[in-house]
């Protein structure tokens, strides 16, 4: 048998060479071309274990994309036909709790997460026989990467589930901690930095493999809080990074997520986007916005993928992506997954599983409205590869898709048999569909979140609502003491007001200059390279946010060190998450407050407002009876007509849908 | 313009159940989030329930959750508050009101544009 060369197993402390056999009814026999369903007998530490996979067909939608640029640095779209994939999910037969995660492409490579263990599989290089080495994830060498935090073991879990009868692929795979009864789809788009590619080859299809293993393995393991990943996109800057990487993992977020808004949004529409990129923080793995995920602004983050496995760089992505889902570091928390670390501790273990504190951080999101944009199953233009009725995701070809027939029978729109709408029904989901009817047009289906927002309202001929839009960056708000930013009013009392509650406003500006001079992390201008940044004397109101009149202390699943500063008759409160230096500190200023006359907070600095490009004259564009939007439309007040509020009507704008029903004006009069 | 007229008040017994009406008119109704507030004797205007027309998104006071049901029927231009398990402390006057903001506001009454006229609820013990 062929030895394993040093390179693929310098990373690991111990593993066993085996070669799996594939599984017939008739036979056990040597591998053949992959299909929809197979199954396996592998070996692991004496024992033999079957495993049974289906092709993962939730993955990639049908217009799964990707963007590269050529020489002169065009953008080229790309639409791959990968339709009949080689990534697979499945479990381990007479095993609790177990999932997989694997591609057969060229062998087996992939993840098993066994009841007490994860292992991964890999082809042995240079076989002629199948053979492949197996390995505990816990015995794969790491270096000591971090999310801020010092790493702190966690309990280990003892419950176990009671099983009747042999439970069918889908009720295995969403039987783990479901910790909602209602399946969230998170729409993921990758970018690929150009060390990265580099570091590939320059080998597009290998990259494109690569991060398509990735996302299988993704979702094998946010399966267990019954959230799918659905890889929408994947860009790879072939010809250059398209933001500055110099400087802290910070700036490289922040300078991510403006690119992303920017540039990328109007691309192809995702929920988050995550960053991989080669260059290392100097031991952080990675950087991310908590609970942001459905944010024009900040639904981001950033990974880093050095000298480690992809398998192991899935669990520093799943960390990441799980901060934008709302979830806190684990540490300090009670939190317990069953394994000895989890996914959300702070120190970058490799885990594959989520905590408890997890599954709660991810619950309170989902209640407090911020995961709203995972609920929409992806359009049939989205929906993801080798359709399939049946499997509650709208795919190319389907009116709809109410699941198992089971499920079905309580849909009263939807065939199941055929996953077409019913002879009598328009529509069987979505915001603007009730009881299998289009909602009037004119029927508010996404109301007012702030008063830098503007509703929008159903078409009357279509389930879904109008595209999300708000009031342009830069319009006054709050009697002018204030700019609207990505939809909402940013002012200090405001956000006083959220961190210590209602009676809470902002502390005298002599607070901010005097706290947040001392370069230390409770008063700060950001974080460069190992230390914070002391701010000048005029960027001291967009450091650490400083409140007074403070009645309440915060709790939100994460206990802060919170520091009172006497100052001129007056006590400055200011707080630390200690979230870690892989996530941006809500305790600092928001971006977009009003620091001055004329004046914005932006990476930590008091700019010229003008970096907003706000350049809407309601006065002449909308004739003083609206606002522009994010479009630079006008959104008309109630009595005035889009599209420039000239002649009388019923508001709104030609992004917004009709306020009110055109086709059946008897109905409403 | 949007106008709304409540009905369906009443007295009732402790434990007995009502359902309040509100009826929109206005060519631009089906624009608005619909929510009930009270105004109990001695005390402050308080939220009691919101929706909106499609009947997916609900929201309700802690002290009425699992008794009380907003419904909405598009069709008929009305909302519905079906009261059960009525207390004394329920005794108010209901009003209904329209708003255009989402959920993160409904709960405020200042952000309402449109108000009824209100329908008194009595629950004697």
């Known amino acids: 048998a062929a030895r394993p060369g040093f390179q693929q197993t310098s990373h690991l402390s111990s593993y066993e060479i085996i070669t799996p056999w594939r599984l017939t009814r008739e036979r056990r026999e040597a591998p053949r071309p992959y299909s929809k369903q197979v199954s396996y007998v592998i070996q692991a530490e004496g024992k033999e274990h079957i495993i049974h996979l289906e092709r993962n067909k939730d993955l990639l939608p049908e217009d799964f994309v990707v963007y590269t640029y050529n020489k002169e640095g065009t953008l080229i779209t790309d639409h791959p036909n990968i339709q009949n994939h080689c990534h697979y999910r499945g479990y381990v037969e007479g095993v609790h709790n177990s999932s997989i995660a694997l591609s057969d492409c060229f062998g087996l490579r992939g993840l098993l997460h066994l009841e007490n263990a994860s292992y991964g599989i890999e082809p042995l290089q240079n076989s002629s026989h199948f053979e492949h080495i197996i390995y505990r994830m816990d015995d794969v060498y790491k270096e000591p990467l971090k999310c801020g935090v010092s790493n702190k073991d966690i309990e280990k879990e003892t419950a176990k589930d009671e099983e009747e009868e042999p439970p069918s692929m889908t009720q295995l795979l969403r039987r783990r901690r479901a910790v909602l009864p209602q399946t969230r789809y998170v729409e993921l788009f990758i970018v690929v930095d150009k060390e990265r590619y580099d570091m590939m080859g320059r080998n597009q299809t290998a990259v494109r493999e690569e991060m398509i293993l990735l996302a299988n393995y993704l979702d094998s393991m946010y399966i267990m809080l019954n959230i799918r990943i659905v890889l929408v996109g994947l860009e790879i800057w072939t010809n250059g990074n398209l933001i500055n990487i110099v400087g802290g993992a910070g700036d490289v977020l922040g300078n991510f997520v403006q690119w992303r808004e920017k540039f990328l949004i109007t691309r192809r529409r995702h929920d988050s986007a995550q960053l991989v990129l080669k260059k290392g923080f100097g031991g952080t793995a990675g950087m991310a916005f908590v609970g942001t995920v459905c944010s024009r602004s900040h639904a981001g983050g950033i990974n880093v993928f050095g000298q480690i496995t992809v398998e192991t760089f899935a669990s520093i992505v799943a960390h990441e992506l799980g901060h934008n889902l709302g979830m806190n570091h684990d540490d300090g928390r009670d939190c317990s997954c069953g394994a000895k670390s989890c996914i959300m501790n702070s120190g970058a273990s490799g885990s594959r599983n989520f905590s408890s504190c997890s599954a709660e951080d991810f619950e309170k999101l989902t209640l407090n409205k911020g995961g709203n944009c995972l609920l929409n199953i992806p359009k049939p233009d989205e929906a993801y590869s080798a359709p399939s009725c049946g499997n509650k995701l709208v795919d190319a070809g389907e009116e709809c898709d109410c699941g198992t027939p089971k499920e079905c029978e309580l849909d009263p729109c939807c065939e199941g048999s055929t996953c077409k709408l019913k002879s009598f029904a328009e529509c069987a989901y979505g915001d603007c569909c009730k009881d299998c009817r289009f909602l009037p047009g004119g029927t508010l289906c996404r109301g007012k979140t702030s008063e830098c927002d503007v509703p929008e309202y159903c078409n009357g001929s279509s389930q879904f609502c109008q595209p999300d839009v708000f009031i342009q960056n830069g319009y006054p708000c709050q009697n002018n003491k204030a700019y609207c930013y990505n939809g909402m009013c940013q002012y200090y009392d405001a956000q006083c007001q959220v961190i210590f509650g209602s009676k809470a406003k902002a502390a005298p500006k002599d607070c901010f200059i005097e706290v947040n001079s001392k370069g230390d992390r409770f008063g700060n201008c950001g974080f460069s390279g190992n230390e914070y940044k002391k701010c000048a004397t005029g960027n001291a109101l967009c450091g650490k946010l400083q409140c007074e009149n403070v009645q309440e202390i915060p709790v939100f699943g994460i206990v802060p060190a919170i520091i009172q500063t006497p100052s001129r008759g007056t006590k400055c409160w200011g707080v630390d998450f200690q979230l870690g230096s892989d996530v941006p500190d809500p305790g600092m200023v928001n971006e977009g407050t009003k620091c001055g006359a004329g004046k914005i907070c932006r990476n930590f600095q008091c700019v010229d407002a003008s970096v907003l490009n706000y350049d809407c004259d309601v006065q002449k564009k909308c004739h003083g009876h609206g606002v522009c939007n994010s479009n630079k439309n006008c959104h008309c007040e109630n009595g005035w007509a889009p599209p420039n509020c000239e002649t009388k009507g019923y508001g709104g704008s030609v992004d917004s849908g009709p306020t009110y029903n055109e086709m059946n004006t008897a109905l409403r009069d | 313009e949007v106008q709304l007229v409540e009905s369906g008040g009443g007295l009732v017994q402790a434990g007995g159940s009502l359902r309040l009406s509100c009826s929109s008119s206005g060519r631009t109704y089906s624009a608005y989030n619909m929510g009930w507030f009270r105004l109990r004797p001695g005390k402050e205007r308080e939220f009691v329930a919101a929706i909106n027309w499609s009947g997916g998104t609900q929201d309700y006071v802690d002290s009425v959750k699992g008794r009380f049901t907003a419904i909405a029927d598009v069709a008929k231009k009305t909302v519905f508050l079906q009261m059960t398990s009525l207390k004394p402390e329920d005794t108010a006057v209901y009003y209904c009101?329209?708003?255009?903001?989402?959920?993160?506001?409904?709960?405020?009454?200042?952000?309402?544009?449109?108000w009824g006229q209100g329908t008194q609820v009595t629950v004697s013990s």
């Open positions: 009101a329209a708003t255009q903001w989402g959920s993160s506001g409904w709960k405020q009454a200042r952000w309402y544009d449109f």
